[in-house]
Amino acid sequence: NECPELQPPVHGKIEPSQAKYFFKDQVLVSCDTGYKVLKDNVEMDTFQIECLKDGTWSNKIPTCKIVDCRAPGELEHGLITFSTRNNLTTYKSEIKYSCQEPYYKMLNNNTGIYTCSAQGVWMNKVLGRSLPTCLPECGQPSRSLPSLVKRIIGGRNAEPGLFPWQALIVVEDTSRVPNDKWFGSGALLSASWILTAAHVLRSQRRDTTVIPVSKEHVTVYLGLHDVRDKSGAVNSSAARVVLHPDFNIQNYNHDIALVQLQEPVPLGPHVMPVCLPRLEPEGPAPHMLGLVAGWGISNPNVTVDEIISSGTRTLSDVLQYVKLPVVPHAECKTSYESRSGNYSVTENMFCAGYYEGGKDTCLGDSGGAFVIFDDLSQRWVVQGLVSWGGPEECGSKQVYGVYTKVSNYVDWVWEQMGLPQSVVEPQVER
């Protein structure tokens, strides 16, 4: 009743290992680390066979098959490179996830290296089996913005990609007869969120309470350079419109709002977010220079319908930008207090412009970003949003443009976007 000698499978072993096996002896076949027992096309950890009464084994010896982690999961806004030849996905093979640079960066500077484990899953030393996250890079235009020399640049054409965060917000309120249509600007904060001024997204006619316009009435254009040619731009509808709960219609205090886009927009050379500032109540320092971009649609004779309908020329078809210094708060307050009218420059606002006038945010539509280059992070940061100005013609002497101080609202913005600040801080500060 002796059974034939057993040969262990390649990359495997049999236990107990004996010189001879007799009736009722049992052996357990197992495989080396990184291999699985394969029997009749079924994978298992071990396989048991028995020496039968007639001197035969109850089953043939199975084979040992190398563990296969199979094709790795797709990474949103990322790509995969195989470190092993022939794009192998078997035990100890290595892959590397990377983000679509320069538009996305891996969260926590992860290596992105994953190894196929003995359990058949792709494993990273830090994240385990979880995939890395590709976050949008912010404040780094594909084209370098001009050096900030202290001179006025007004009505200068912006090259495509110079202000990749710039959004044109078009609102058509169909609840009124005839329909109301207006526009504003905004700044892309992530693939799904636009920062703008609250007054842009508030119903324009007689609503005495701060009611946001219906999300169905909002369209956002990104990557737009020339308003006559929207073919290259991304247009998106709104999933949510969020006004700051304390926005005051009388004095424009807390003039800040967010639009969540229906679908995340693909980032590229002409569509990239701007960085949010650090939480700092002081806001930008006096005399710091910032840039504001806009389509300069400040000619009262130009209607929104002309701006939005293709083929119609306006005075500023191409995105314009202006360079302005931050004005000391006390100076701005005094300048407005000396005017007739109830002007209130609060601690949630700052002013920018020149005493002698000449250029102003007539060039930038309401809600547009006032950006300052942050030397520490080497990125452009949105410090202000175009909010309001005096009754005189914009660009008048000693009439400064007033901006929402974004740094006072950083926590509120993160909260609305549903992102913990720790997740996004690395993209603002290095």
């Epitope: 169909t174 007869v177 005839p178 249509k181 207006w182 842009v200 609503d207």
Partner: antibody, heavy 113, light 112 residues
């Protein structure tokens, strides 16, 4: 075509309330503001307020705040205006209109003891 | 509230002649966002509801004869009937909807 049809004339005693209806047809009722305007005999037009049926948002002229109430029933495309604590000077023709353009035929409300 | 003042209170014009009605608001009706003046003109004939003639100060409602035109911006507005017809005898009202709406007191147009 867009039409607004109002309920019939009412005679009320001072201190009572009146509820005027305005049935809309020919457009999406929930998406447009309905305004209410009144006109006293031989007088000019006076704006009372408005309602957006889809959301229930309302705006009232200061004079009618707390005394006028607007409601809307989307299932029947009907807007309602209720005016309480009636006095003789509330005697007027009450009109509903779709935002700016189309007017109802008017409802005469007479307040008399 | 914005106060709307119409002038004159009444107007007698010969058939085929021009009729001009003015409307002045106590504050500007020009919305800087939409670049529209929120002023409308209505015509009301006896026993009828008002009828919209002009909106946004100068845009003629469809179906309104082109002898009716609106002009003005900010605080001063005008309704012009270029050649008065018998059927134009009515009371004309201006209405602002820049804020909580208010009407002018009305101008009665008659045939001389």
């Amino acid at each position: 075509q867009v039409q607004l049809v109002q309920s019939g004339a009412e005679v009320k005693k001072p201190g009572a309330s009146v509820k005027v209806s305005c049935k809309a047809s020919g457009y999406t009722f929930t998406g447009k503001w309905i305004e209410w305007v009144r006109q006293a005999p031989g007088q000019g037009l006076e704006w009372i307020g408005e309602i957006l049926p889809g959301t229930g948002s309302t705006n009232y002229a200061q004079k009618f705040q707390g005394r006028a109430t607007f409601t809307a029933d989307s299932s029947t495309s009907t807007a309602y205006m209720e005016l309480s604590s009636l006095r003789s000077e509330d005697t007027a023709v009450y009109y509903c209109l779709r935002s700016e353009d189309v007017w109802g035929q008017g409802t005469l409300v007479t307040v008399s003891s | 509230d914005i106060v709307m003042t119409q002038s004159p209170d009444s107007l007698a014009v010969s058939l085929g002649e021009r009729a001009t009605i003015n409307c002045k608001s106590s504050q500007s009706l020009l919305n800087s966002r939409t670049r529209k003046n929120y002023l409308a003109w209505y015509q009301q004939k006896p026993g009828q509801p008002p009828k919209l003639l002009i909106y946004w100060a100068s845009t003629r409602e469809s179906g309104v004869p082109d002898r009716f035109s609106g002009s003005g911006s900010g605080t001063d507005f005008t309704l012009t009937i270029s050649s008065l017809q018998a059927e134009d005898v009515a009371v004309y009202y201006c209405k602002q909807s820049y804020n909580i709406p208010t009407f002018g007191q009305g101008t009665k147009v008659e045939i001389k």
